[in-house]
């Protein structure tokens, strides 16, 4: 796989370890945790980077309003199976043998269940919608030139297809910005949307995955935008399969947390 | 390591223009902006305006506008502040700062260039 | 404009002692940029977003406030901290600073 050849590292994803062990002491590098070979010319899916992080040391409105069956992801994290490919097994389960089926962006999209609990496939997220509030700015967004720039974004810094960002809404402060795929749309090579849209919450957070950069400097116009929120729905080709007891509020008790729908708070 | 090193010491007469310059090194050039600021004898930090190498957006305080230009070269990571129209309240150091960002924080003016006085005298 | 006041104009304290410098803002603003500068030498940042220490900056200086009014704190002054110190606003355009307030010895 491509890495930079004159150090041996991974552009795309720094929770590897790279050697020059292979074919023709070419760079390879490993996810951490899996110990999966990554293409360093591209993402890392959300599932290897999930299970790496795991394995590291702990240290009149023109916005969108999710559908009903949008998730967001309020599980927080967990150590995800991966298939060899690195996508997310549709059924994931932790220690205590309590299990779930997740979506492909590793949503939990069911009730929690034991060992007896199927999840037939892995369902696609087709439509990811990324709603951030931006940081009050001395100079105002022009709407255009920030949909520019962040079309400009995802294509280069996320290597993302232009046609897969769908919309990018602008209503001060609030930025939305839609991703679909359909499993129909998306050709071999193809970046994930799942794990763009993964990139990009963990650049806003501070937290690049990309090798050695700083952090990622935003700008529109020359004039920085600042993310201080930002809450992501994903929605996919089949609705998620909940009990009512959690659509009507249950279910959250004890401390635990659910992939709410959007009118609950967060 | 980040550095700003701006051009020498100038005397204008009234009416005259003055240009600065301000060359960067240490860090991608295009990656943040380039202010201007300047301090008068005696007086506080003033703002001017800035330019944003990779795309040549600028801002102006409003005070200088029509008066101030700001220009960049980046085949040579220098940035030019012209400023017409000279009078004598114009005495002052000039100084460059660069501004660093990203999406969680704004790292202020960070490093300044040594400072240019420039003195308008007839 | 956002016009910041500082107070107060000047400070006379001896060295170990703890220097609390204030700045207030004409309307509310969400973050305050602090800076030294010494005779003869360009300013230099201490404090961005108005709490976060910049880069080699001491621990001994600590910023804080929201809304008008802002604060920088030197806990224990040590001789090289004798200097003005200014605040600065990115909330509006123009960008503004205050006045500045002269840290002298005692």
């Known amino acids: 796989h491509t890495a930079a050849q004159d150090n041996c590292t991974c552009p795309t994803n720094k929770m590897t370890v790279c050697s020059p062990d292979g074919p023709g002491g070419r760079c390879q590098c490993r996810a951490l945790g899996s110990g999966v070979a990554v293409d360093c010319s591209t993402l890392t899916s959300k599932c290897l980077l999930l299970k790496a992080r795991m394995s590291a040391p702990k240290n009149a409105r023109t916005l969108v309003r999710p559908n009903e069956h949008a998730l967001v992801d309020n599980d927080g994290l967990y150590d995800p199976d991966c298939d060899p490919e690195g996508r997310f097994k549709a059924r994931q389960c932790n220690q205590t043998s309590v299990c779930w089926c997740v979506n492909s962006v590793g949503v939990r999209r069911t009730d929690k269940g034991d060992l007896s609990l199927r999840c037939d496939e892995l369902v696609r997220t087709h439509h990811i919608l990324i709603d951030l509030r931006h940081r009050p700015t001395a100079g105002a967004f022009n709407h255009s030139d920030l949909d520019a720039e962040l079309r400009r974004l995802f294509r280069e810094r996320y290597r993302l297809h232009p046609k897969f960002v769908a919309a990018v809404h602008y209503e001060q402060p609030t930025i939305q910005i839609e991703l679909r795929q359909n499993t129909s749309q998306k050709a071999a090579g193809d970046v994930d949307i799942g794990d763009a849209a993964y990139y990009f919450e963990r650049d806003v957070k501070g937290e690049s995955l990309f090798q050695g950069r700083g952090g990622l400097d935003l700008r529109v116009r020359g004039e920085p935008l600042q993310v201080e929120r930002t809450l992501i729905y994903y929605l996919d080709e089949i609705p998620p399969k909940f009990s009512m007891k959690r659509l009507t509020g249950g279910g959250s008790g004890g401390g635990s947390h659910h992939h709410h729908h959007h009118h609950h708070h967060h | 390591q980040v550095q700003l090193v701006q051009s020498g010491a100038e005397v204008k007469k009234p009416g005259a223009s003055v240009k600065v310059s301000c060359k960067a090194s240490?860090?991608?050039?295009?990656?943040?902006?380039i202010n201007w600021v300047r301090q008068r004898p005696g007086q506080g930090l003033e703002w001017m305006g800035w330019?944003?190498?990779?795309?040549?957006?600028?801002k102006y305080n409003e005070k200088f506008k029509g008066r101030v230009t700001m220009t960049v070269d980046t085949s040579t990571s220098t940035v030019y502040m012209e400023l017409s129209s000279l009078r004598s309240e114009d005495t002052a150091v000039y100084y460059c700062?660069?501004?660093?960002?990203?999406?969680?924080?704004?790292?202020?003016?960070?490093?300044w260039g040594q400072g240019t006085l420039v003195t308008v005298s007839s | 404009e956002i016009v910041l006041t500082q107070s107060p104009a000047t400070l006379s304290l001896s060295p170990g002692e703890r220097a609390t410098l204030s700045c207030s803002a004409s309307s509310s603003v969400n973050y305050i940029y602090w800076y030294q500068r010494k005779p003869g030498q360009a300013p230099r940042l201490l404090i961005y977003d108005t709490s976060n220490l910049a880069s080699g900056i001491p621990a001994r200086f600590s910023g804080s406030g929201s809304g008008t009014d802002y604060t920088l704190t030197i806990s224990s002054l040590e001789p090289e901290d004798f200097a003005v110190y200014y605040c600065q606003q990115w909330n509006s355009y123009p960008l503004t600073f205050g006045q500045g307030t002269k840290v002298e010895i005692k």
């Open positions: 330019i944003y190498p990779r795309d040549g957006s600028k």
């Open positions: 240490g860090y991608t050039f295009t990656s943040s902006d």
């Open positions: 700062a660069t501004r660093f960002a990203t999406v969680v924080s704004n790292y202020g003016l960070d490093p």
